[in-house]
Interface confidence: low
């Protein structure tokens, strides 16, 4: 997260760290007791490593009573996701067992009504992604509030040049932005999961290159079918 600040510890109990061989790779969001939603491209970087999900964490390194690492029973990328595009960049991870819920571990309600968030709405994005262009990684969860940017502006030739489909949304990126390592994490508007950080290699913190998020409401049928 660029231009953000340290999050209040355990105030985002839905927050997950998707890890490979014990290292943070991507963000994720607990959407059901046994399911974490993340970005499909995150798996590409996992190669053949052991994928696990850390829940209940604030610090990645320090012991915390609520922290627990779960093995992944099943990884289900969206069937239409492709390595060369950010379209359909969603991944559902089934934990090896139901998560132990508590104040620091709780699923987040996700948006099912397929309607765009009003431009200008302030939404919260959190993650353990890099906090500087030099690539410095934080140990503790960071967050930032970002205004939603309308799709027409986001699709301007000077911005994302038409790449933003109806199934995506954008947020402003003027110095405050999600960045590498935040992919798969939640964009939360009004206490509801609206978007998932896409995992393309995008310049961060440049206002002409807004953050791109996959709109979960556009994938309600797919999410329901996997969770069923």
């Amino acid at each position: 997260i660029l231009g953000g600040r340290e999050a209040e510890a355990h105030a985002r109990p839905y927050m997950a760290s998707v890890q490979v061989n014990g290292e943070h790779l991507c963000g994720g969001v607990l959407v059901a007791e046994q399911w974490v939603l993340s970005a499909a491209h995150c798996l590409e970087d996992a190669a053949d490593g052991k994928v696990q999900v850390l829940l209940g964490a604030h610090s990645l390194s320090q012991p915390e009573p609520s922290k627990r690492l779960y093995d992944v029973l099943r990884a289900v990328p969206h069937p239409d996701s492709r390595p060369d595009t950010i379209d359909h960049d969603l991944l559902l991870l089934q934990l090896s067992e139901k998560a132990t819920l508590g104040p620091a571990v709780r699923p987040l309600p996700w948006q099912r009504v397929d309607r765009d968030v009003e431009p200008g709405t302030l939404c919260d994005v959190a993650g353990w992604g890099i906090v500087s262009h030099a690539g410095r990684r934080p140990d503790r969860l960071q967050h930032v509030l970002l205004p939603v940017l309308d799709r027409a502006t986001c699709n301007r030739r000077t911005h994302h040049d038409g790449a933003i489909t109806q199934r995506m949304m954008c947020a402003e990126s003027n110095r405050r932005d999600s960045c590498k390592g935040d992919s798969g994490g939640p964009l939360v508007c009004g206490g509801v999961l609206e978007g998932v950080v896409t995992s393309g290699s995008r310049v961060c913190g440049n206002r002409k290159k807004p953050g791109i998020y996959t709109r979960v409401a556009s994938y309600a049928a797919w999410i329901d079918s996997v969770l069923a």
Epitope: D116, A152, T153, G162
Partner: antibody, heavy 122, light 107 residues
């Protein structure tokens, strides 16, 4: 199927105003700028301006800034253009047009309304 | 404003011929050029965008080329239904501007 349905022909008196409409269907109205283009025999095609249906923000061709006002009604997915202080030079066919996008690249004005003929005559 | 000049207002050709319609911009527009076809009584129809990319459903006899200030629309083998007005347009900077049009007539 993307469609832009414009209002019918208008016969108006010099000095009057006219408001023409363009109803969009088959795509997300708020996702793409709506453009307006004038076609007259003398000047061929001229871009009047565009409006961002999501925010109502407009960009005008300076030449038309005092002549045209662009608005939208998101609830009905309709764009409007009001032309004021009409003269015979404003007699023309007016089109609404929207760019559309495929994959990751901008496409020109891929969709056009059928045009609205405005005739200014005493 | 960027001026787009189509030097030929009319071009006469025969069915099966190859024809090239040219367009010159008053400054470098970095391939941000679209081509439109307009048949009598119809709205303009997008043929080519980004100077050389054919729009969906456009026959492959239509080809766009060019860079900098000079752009060309080529019809490799003219068909009777290609009788129309052809316009270039720049989307490099606002106000977007069109050429004056070239009317293709069939001999």
């Amino acid at each position: 199927e993307v469609q832009l349905q414009q209002s019918g022909p208008e016969l108006v008196k010099p000095g009057a105003s006219v408001k023409i409409s363009c109803k969009a269907s088959g795509y997300s109205f708020t996702g793409y700028y709506m453009n307006w283009v004038k076609q007259s025999p003398e000047k061929s095609l001229e871009w009047i301006g565009d409006i961002n249906p999501s925010t109502g923000g407009t960009t005008y061709n300076q030449k038309f800034k005092a002549k045209a006002t662009l608005t939208v009604d998101k609830s009905s997915s309709t764009a409007y253009m009001q032309l004021k202080s009409l003269t015979s030079e404003d007699s023309a066919v007016y089109y609404c047009a929207t760019p559309y996008y495929y994959g990751s690249s901008y496409v020109g004005f891929a969709y056009w309304g059928q045009g609205t003929l405005v005739t200014v005559s005493a | 404003d960027i001026v787009m000049t189509q030097s030929h207002k009319f071009m006469s050709t025969s069915v099966g011929d190859r024809v090239s319609i040219t367009c010159k911009a008053s400054q470098d527009v970095s391939t941000a050029v679209d081509w439109y076809q307009q048949k009598p009584g119809q709205s303009p129809k997008l043929l080519i965008y980004w100077a050389s990319t054919r729009h969906t459903g456009v026959p492959d006899r239509f080809t766009g080329s060019g860079s900098g200030t000079d752009y060309t629309l080529t019809i490799s083998s003219v068909q009777a239904e290609d009788l129309a007005l052809y316009y270039c347009q720049q989307h490099y900077s606002t106000p977007w501007t069109f050429g004056g049009g070239t009317k293709l007539e069939i001999k």
